[in-house]
Interface confidence: medium
């Protein structure tokens, strides 16, 4: 909604003419004091809609708020409106005239209220007085609304000075009403139902004896009324409930069910709403997916969680390599499915102290008569690396051959390193990495095998040292995401008798 000129407040000269335009992407109209003044509404050549309000020969009586609203405002669209305020200073008019019922102000509890005496000129100074005592009260004044504050049960008048004459407003009477605050709660037996099932909604009020229930629900639109049942639940505090029951739900019963509770002695009220969805058939839907490969660490516990939405309650089965799983008596495997909200579920598979044999393909299947869903993943069990052997051999050609064998999951990396100064190795001197050197001093060959039955990799790395001219400390280190392991061996030249 776009208002031109934009405002939000205008001060007009008496007898002048003022044009206000409101434009939007849907038909609009102007409202003043809930009345619709004469205006020109049109669709423009650019496809927008506008309404032009022309105020001619304005007087003090034109002072007030004007709203631009959508002209078929129903339901929540009512709140979508734009306000501007116009002052027309009129020395002949003191306070704006009031309807007699607006002079009686009913207050419940200690709440802020407004004594709505308004003037046509925003420059005027206005004071509030208790009628009996002619002393101004220190209450903030808003020229567009009046005096805003907390008032006792007394009689009040507003005063202002126009030129050299003092002007009094009508008398305002403030009355306090004791009504306990309304506390409404609305709940449904189920907010998701299949067609043919029943809808039951309860609206409960605490601590008030005289209340009026008013329901709005989707069936009202087609003129089919449902008779609610009022239920008195005696006790301390007292509770009154209204129950709306639809025995056989239809798809058109989907929507918002609103319970409006009002107290007849005042305008006190509260409103609560709940959404109900009627579905043709039940459903099961995954809310989160899992990576295709899930990792567990050997001898650690691992919980795998699947979140899904379903109605009605589904059965849940877990499978490993196409065989159904169940809670094990040894407590190595725990299955649980929790209902975390009306239609949301969390199914968990917990593997306690994971074993290598628990690696494999897992599937969770959630199903009922109307629908089913399944989620599969591969469980990989990670095993720390171990160097199983580091051996050396001396073929006749004078080479030294070192063979390092180890296992782990995921696949380990092999690093060979050497250290020549035995006294300072490896604490004080960093080892030198070895590999296939261009000088052909060393040659490295690594073979990897995956052992299906053990679900882990075996690495065999062979290091050929062409000639060794002094004692060397050689280390083979295996490393993967689970950690590292190493072994060392001391290699001596063929010609050198070496004692450790």
């Amino acid at each position: 909604l776009v208002i031109t000129p934009p405002g939000p407040e205008f001060v007009l000269n008496i007898s002048s003419t003022f044009v206000l335009t409101c434009s939007s992407s849907a038909p609009v109209m102007w409202e003043q004091m809930s009345q619709v003044p004469w205006q020109e509404a049109a669709m423009n050549q650019d496809g927008t809609f506008s309404s032009v309000l022309t105020l001619t020969n304005v007087t003090g009586g034109d002072t007030g708020e004007y709203f631009c609203v959508y002209n078929n405002s129903l339901g929540p669209e009512l709140s979508e409106r734009k306000r501007i305020y116009i002052f027309v200073p009129d020395p002949t008019m003191g306070f704006l005239p009031m309807d007699s019922e607006d002079l009686f102000i009913f207050v419940t509890d200690v709440t802020e209220t407004t004594i709505p005496c308004r003037v046509t000129d925003p420059q005027l100074e206005v004071t509030l007085h208790e009628k009996k005592v002619d002393i101004p009260l220190h209450v903030p004044y808003d020229h567009q609304r009046g005096f805003i504050g907390t008032f006792e049960d007394k009689t009040y008048i507003c005063k202002t000075t126009i030129g050299d004459r003092e002007v009094d407003s009508d008398t305002y009477y403030v009355y306090s009403l004791q009504v306990s605050s309304i506390n409404v709660s609305v709940n449904a037996v189920q907010t998701v139902v299949r067609q043919g099932e029943s809808i039951t909604i309860r609206c409960i009020v605490m601590g008030n004896d005289v209340v009026n229930f008013q329901w709005t629900y989707p069936r009202m639109k087609s003129g089919r009324l449902v008779e609610p049942v009022t239920d008195y639940l005696f006790g301390v505090p007292s509770r009154i409930g209204s129950i709306l029951h639809i025995p056989t739900a239809e798809l058109s019963d989907s929507g918002t069910y609103t319970c409006n509770v009002s107290v007849s002695v005042n305008d006190h009220g509260d409103e609560k709403a709940i959404n109900v969805t009627v579905i043709e058939n039940g459903y099961v839907r995954l809310l989160e997916t899992l990576e295709d490969v899930q990792i567990a660490e050997l001898h650690r516990s691992r919980t795998l969680q699947v979140v899904f939405e379903a109605y009605p309650t589904p059965s849940v089965l877990w499978f490993k390599d196409n065989r159904t799983l169940g809670d094990s008596s040894a407590g190595e495997l725990v299955l649980s499915t929790r209902n975390v909200s009306e239609t949301r579920y969390v199914s968990e598979l917990t593997l306690v102290r994971v074993k290598v044999s628990e690696a494999g393909y897992y599937t969770m299947r959630a199903f009922h008569a109307d629908d089913q869903v399944q989620l599969s993943f591969k469980l990989q069990v990670n095993v720390p690396v171990r160097v199983l052997e580091l051996s050396e051999s001396h073929p006749a050609n004078g080479e030294q051959i070192l063979r390092c064998r180890g296992r782990g999951m995921p696949q380990p990396n092999v690093t060979w390193s050497t250290c020549r100064d035995l006294k300072r190795c490896p604490r004080k001197l960093s080892p030198t990495p070895l590999g296939n050197s261009s000088k052909e001093e060393s040659q490295l060959e690594t073979n990897v095998t995956f052992w299906e039955e053990d679900q882990e990799y075996e690495v065999v790395s062979t290091l050929r040292l062409r000639h060794v001219d002094q004692p060397l400390s050689v280390r083979c280190m295996l490393q993967n995401s689970m950690g590292r392991d190493s072994q060392e061996v001391t290699v001596v030249p063929h010609s050198l008798p070496f004692k450790v």
Partner: nanobody, 118 residues
Framework: EVQLVESGGGTVQAGDSLRLSCTAS????????MGWFRQAPGKERVVVAV???????VHQPSVKGRFTMSRDNTKNSIYLQMDSLKPEDTAVYYC????????????WGQGTQVTVSS
């Protein structure tokens, strides 16, 4: 961001019919006011028909009774059924979208040519 794609234009004889379609991307289609506009050679672009987010449909007087605009929120689409076409209906027809609460059309299609020969 809304993308609009028109289709259904072409060349027809006076008195024939054509149906234009416009499909929008985006999940909040129902909250937009949608409009059909046209621009004849050498003239300004003018509105033909509008369907608002709160479900008013308004047609320009010159096409009333001959053109019917409709909308299908489930398909994110609007349509313009053009019957009893006249040579003066020859123009590029554009589909446009205006967000709720604004007073302008921020999103436009590329246009589709309609030619009516006598």
């Amino acid at each position: 961001e809304v993308q609009l794609v028109e289709s259904g234009g072409g060349t027809v004889q006076a008195g024939d019919s054509l149906r234009l379609s416009c499909t929008a991307s985006g999940r909040t289609f129902s909250t937009y006011t949608m409009g059909w506009f046209r621009q004849a050679p050498g003239k300004e672009r003018v509105v033909v028909a509008v369907n608002t987010w709160n479900n008013f449909t308004v047609h320009q007087p010159s096409v009333k009774g001959r053109f019917t605009m409709s909308r299908d929120n489930t398909k994110n689409s609007i349509y313009l059924q053009m019957d009893s076409l006249k040579p003066e209906d020859t123009a590029v027809y554009y589909c446009a979208a205006s967000a709720k609460g604004t007073a302008r059309y921020d999103y436009w299609g590329q246009g589709t040519q309609v030619t009516v020969s006598s």
